[in-house]
């Protein structure tokens, strides 16, 4: 129960995680424009990673794209990169992983084969994390090192009296947004990878040997546990616990609707 | 048509407060923004601030904070403006104009002036 | 605050003639983000309100003869007027669209010769 549920919880905090890595690469506000220390402006400029965009005090929003490509910083282009990356591969990870859910049955698909499924979707979620936080940081250190270089030259003189004010920007929504989709996403490729590890099925030294007694039908099973009668006895290596309880596979045939989230 | 109907003239002694109105048509009143702008007898246009009345966000040139009060009424699209403690430097013209949309906050409708004399 | 610099402060005119004003901010009324300058051009006649002209430094208000045009960038515009009419006897006045407070230019006034 605790490795569906924590596969699970992986797969949706995953979900979130690149829901919101995909919500903050087409969000327009990566840097916004600082307003502290700085004339009061009528304009508010903020910029995304595909446009960049003006709101004027009327509520009037003009947008323009970004028309060109070689035009455009090496970092603007890698940060598009990384985001793009960390989508395609959470995107990947997220339909590798449905079919890795425990609650959910694909023909005979066999415990093995849905714990490697889980690992790789785990490992993939991680990646597309990094990914994330990767991007978002190179933007942000970007805009850092601009802020600073602006700072230091924020007025330049023109002719003595006429000054030109530099737009310096700042961290925007979009920055906190894929910094905080970045972890989920790496978080919920953490717990896949650990429910990765319960899904595997444990192997044990010993093969299950039948002693046939006459006259009865018991099947004995070296290793300390608990003899399970009949001659149609599972034959898979499952451990069989005390008290006669079988193991989750065997007794939940169809999945509940407490695996659904 | 867009109007913006501004109230009568005023006569006010030093000291005293006055309220005028800009009432306007023609248009979504919350939709735009309304600035008020003075204007003293043979000199030039002084902004005094806007009030945005879709949701009564305010901006005040500091020189008129304190002086003046914008507010707007939805329910009858009418904006207003209070000046206190009037001095003989408050007669003056006083505009209401509608910002347009779109238009770099140009200023493209524009009332007929409320005209405030301060005498004693 | 901006400072707006009218000049000249008064024209004296003859109908059909082509006027050139101009006006001066103390900063820079191009934004850098969409590359546009914010400035207005407005008219006033007596005992009227002003009247809007141009807007982002060149784009004719509708309803303004193409007689009126706006140009210029930065810190520096011009409004031109290419064949003066009595009816466009006024004071003309530029204001910063950009930056709060906004301001308005001290106006020159165009007169009949």
């Known amino acids: 129960m605790a490795v569906t549920a924590c596969q699970g919880l992986g797969f949706v905090v995953s979900l979130i995680g690149i829901a919101g890595i995909i919500a903050a690469t087409c969000m327009d506000q990566w840097s916004t424009q600082d307003l502290y220390n700085n004339p009061v402006t009528a304009v508010f400029n903020y910029q995304g990673l595909w446009r960049s965009c003006v709101r004027e005090s009327s509520g009037f929003t003009e947008c323009r794209g970004y028309f060109t490509l070689l035009g455009l910083p090496a970092m603007l282009q890698a940060v598009r990169a990384l985001m793009i990356v960390g989508i395609v591969l959470g995107a990947i990870g997220l339909l590798v992983s449905i079919f890795a859910l425990k609650c959910i049955r694909i023909g005979s698909m066999e415990d093995s084969a849905k714990a490697n499924m889980t690992l790789t979707s785990g490992i993939m979620f991680i990646v597309s994390g990094l990914c994330a936080i990767a991007g978002v940081s190179v933007f942000a250190n970007m805009l850092v090192t601009n802020f600073w270089m602006s700072t230091a030259n924020m007025y330049t003189g023109m002719g003595g009296m006429v000054q030109t004010v530099q737009t310096r920007y700042t961290f925007g929504a979009a920055l906190f947004v894929g910094w905080v989709a970045g972890g989920l996403t790496l978080i919920g490729g953490v717990m896949m990878c650990i429910a990765c590890r319960g899904l595997a099925p444990e192997e044990t030294n010993y093969k299950a040997v039948s002693y046939h007694a006459s006259g009865h039908s018991v099947a004995y099973k070296p290793g300390g546990f608990k003899a399970s009668t009949g001659f149609g006895s599972n034959t898979k290596n499952k451990k069989i616990y005390d008290g006669g309880a079988r193991t989750e596979d065997e007794v939940q045939s169809y999945p509940s609707k407490h695996d659904y989230v | 048509e867009v109007q913006l109907q501004q109230s009568g003239p005023e006569l006010v002694k030093p000291g005293a407060s006055v309220k005028m109105s800009c009432k306007a048509s023609?248009?979504?009143?919350?939709?735009?923004?309304i600035h008020w702008v003075k204007q003293k007898p043979g000199q030039g246009l002084e902004w005094i601030g806007y009030?945005?009345?879709?949701?009564?966000?305010?901006k005040y040139n500091e020189k008129f904070k304190g002086k003046a009060t914008l507010t707007s009424d939805k329910s009858s699209s009418t904006a207003y403006m209070e000046l206190s403690s009037l001095t003989s430097e408050d007669s003056a013209v006083y505009y209401c104009?509608?910002?347009?949309?779109?238009?770099?906050?140009?200023?493209?409708?524009w009332g007929q002036g409320t005209s405030v004399t301060v005498s004693s | 605050d901006i400072v707006m610099t009218q000049s000249p402060s008064s024209l004296s005119v003859s109908a059909g003639e082509r006027v050139t004003m101009s006006c001066k901010s103390s900063?820079?009324?191009?934004?850098?983000?969409?590359?546009?300058?914010?400035l207005a051009w407005y008219q006033q006649k007596p005992g009227q309100p002003p009247k809007l002209l141009i807007y982002?430094?060149?784009t004719r208000e509708s309803g303004v003869p193409d007689r009126f045009t706006g140009s210029g960038s930065g810190t520096d515009f011009t409004l031109i007027i290419s064949s003066v009419q009595v009816e466009d006897l006024a004071v003309y006045y530029c204001?910063?669209?950009?930056?709060?407070?906004?301001?308005f230019g001290a106006g020159t006034k165009l007169e009949l010769k």
């Open positions: 009030i945005n009345p879709y949701n009564d966000g305010s």
């Open positions: 104009a509608r910002e347009g949309y779109g238009k770099r906050n140009a200023l493209d409708y």
């Open positions: 204001q910063n669209d950009h930056f709060y407070p906004l301001t």
């Open positions: 900063q820079s009324l191009l934004n850098s983000g969409n590359q546009k300058n914010y």
């Open positions: 982002g430094a060149s």
């Open positions: 023609g248009y979504t009143f919350t939709s735009y923004v």
